[in-house]
């Protein structure tokens, strides 16, 4: 990869292992726990990350309402299952034979099953609603400030097409980014928003995936946009399938 | 030129373990991985996992988890695995072997037989 | 895991005949990112290591015979022997190297007729 020529690193994605092994003794950096060869170039994908991680050595309102279809990652991590193409397998299960239906970002869409459970095809979360509160600040950050500032974050650190940042809504203290992709407005090479929101999740935390560079240093105008809190609500483009209880519990 | 020279044959008991050595010369060790292969008498090949000296990542196929342990010395540039609670099954003929899309570099194999 | 499966499992071919083996693999072993097909031959005669003859999918291996060639992307690959010699008598394998755990298909035994 040309991005990860020069001292064979991967600038993308720290979770890899680069080595001169490439065709023609190039460099070529395989994702930790997949072996798959990762394009150093773009973001890796959210279900190379996962697995990644899992193998790593342990050491008025203008606020969107989430739709009542919205799905919120509450089962954290686990060990995914990844196709050939790094994306996540339509069903995933766990080392006791426990199985369920995921989206196109890792988040489970359906109640728990057996290995008899099917899922037909991977749906497309296609809407993702980043829900964020920063700490107090003097003032309210200028709404249109923040906007740009937020939408050439994701343009120039995630390599997003500005057309997915669908808006920016700010009430102070709360801040929500939506991004919205169909299947139809994907192109080949288009990094898709699910990468681009988990790389952005994680560098909140504190957690960058990128090789090498510094953490996250958000500013309006100059001053710092610290985040205390994160939510994150998924849409699907068809709506989810649990059962009646999970609804009412 | 690059070359992996691999430890002699084993004959070994039921319930016994052996440590199979690899040592490789000709390159930098610590930036490529490196693997294991067993091939039974008469059978095809199977990866059992790999190593990567450098950062000392390890990944094994699921079915030799608990059956095989991969470590590397890079003072020695030196691999290793070690079979464990041997079994008749697991006499073959054991290959290190460079890895990589055009790593064409294996060790000459390791017979380790299984006999009471 | 991926299922790498040869056909034939054995093949017959005069000297100077053209010999064909086919892999087919369970998945496909082309990477999006960077358009590589994650797929190699091997050759091996008795009592020696595999001999490296082709990686991605299509690169003969330096010192490798012209008259061996791989083709093929995705999931269906074919090792070409154009014009076959004695000393091409072997097994040949196929082996996917794209995603853990790597995986070889049951090998093809290559005999003179």
């Known amino acids: 990869h040309t991005a990860a020529q020069d001292n064979c690193t991967c600038p993308t994605n720290k979770m890899t292992v680069c080595s001169p092994d490439g065709p023609g003794g190039r460099c070529q950096c395989r994702a930790l726990g997949s072996g798959m060869a990762v394009d150093c170039s773009t973001l890796t994908s959210k279900c190379l990350l996962l697995k990644a991680r899992m193998s790593a050595p342990k050491n008025a309102r203008t606020l969107v309402r989430p739709s009542e279809h919205a799905l919120v990652d509450n089962d954290g991590l686990y060990d995914p299952d990844c196709d050939p193409e790094g994306r996540f397998k339509a069903r995933q299960c766990n080392q006791t034979s426990v199985c369920w239906c995921v989206n196109s970002v890792g988040v489970r869409r359906t109640d728990k099953g057996d290995l008899s459970l099917r899922c037909d095809e991977l749906v497309r979360t296609h809407h993702i609603l980043i829900d964020l509160r920063h700490r107090p600040t003097a003032g309210a950050f200028n709404h249109s400030d923040l906007d740009a500032e937020l939408r050439r974050l994701f343009r120039e650190r995630y390599r997003l097409h500005p057309k997915f940042v669908a808006a920016v809504h700010y009430e102070q203290p709360t801040i929500q980014i939506e991004l919205r992709q169909n299947t139809s407005q994907k192109a080949a090479g288009d990094v898709d928003i699910g990468d681009a929101a988990y790389y952005f999740e994680r560098d909140i935390k504190g957690e960058s995936l990128f090789q090498g560079r510094g953490g996250l240093d958000l500013r309006v105008r100059g001053e710092p946009l610290q985040v205390e809190r994160t939510l994150i609500y998924y849409l699907d483009e068809i709506p989810p399938k649990f059962s009646m209880k999970r609804l009412t519990a | 030129q690059v070359q992996l020279v691999q430890s002699g044959a084993e004959v070994k008991k039921p319930g016994a373990s052996v440590k199979v050595s690899c040592k490789a010369s000709?390159?930098?060790?610590?930036?490529?991985?490196l693997g294991w292969v067993k091939q039974a008498p008469g059978q095809g090949l199977e990866w059992i996992g790999n190593?990567?000296?450098?950062?000392?990542?390890?990944n094994y196929n699921e079915k030799f988890k608990g059956k095989a342990t991969i470590t590397a010395d890079t003072s020695t540039s030196t691999a290793y695995m070690e079979l464990s609670s041997l079994r008749s099954e697991d006499t073959a003929v054991y290959f290190c072997?460079?890895?990589?899309?055009?790593?064409?570099?294996w060790g000459q194999g390791t017979l380790v037989t299984v006999s009471s | 895991d991926i299922v790498m499966t040869q056909s034939p499992d054995s093949l017959a071919v005069s000297l100077g005949e053209r010999a064909t083996i086919n892999c087919k693999s369970s998945?496909?072993?082309?990477?999006?990112?960077?358009?590589?097909?994650?797929l190699a031959w091997y050759q091996q005669k008795p009592g020696q290591p595999p001999k490296l003859l082709i990686y991605?999918?299509?690169t003969r291996e330096s010192g490798v015979p012209d008259r061996f060639s791989g083709s093929g992307s995705g999931t269906d690959f074919t090792l070409t022997i154009s014009s076959l010699q004695a000393e091409d008598v072997a097994v040949y394998y196929c082996?996917?190297?794209?995603?853990?755990?790597?995986?070889f298909g049951q090998g093809t035994k290559l005999e003179i007729k």
């Open positions: 072997a460079r890895e990589g899309s055009n790593s064409g570099y």
């Open positions: 991605g999918a299509s």
């Open positions: 190593i990567f000296p450098g950062s000392a990542y390890i």
């Open positions: 082996q996917s190297d794209h995603i853990y755990p790597y995986t």
């Open positions: 998945q496909s072993l082309l990477n999006s990112g960077n358009q590589q097909n994650y």
């Open positions: 000709g390159y930098t060790f610590t930036i490529y991985w």
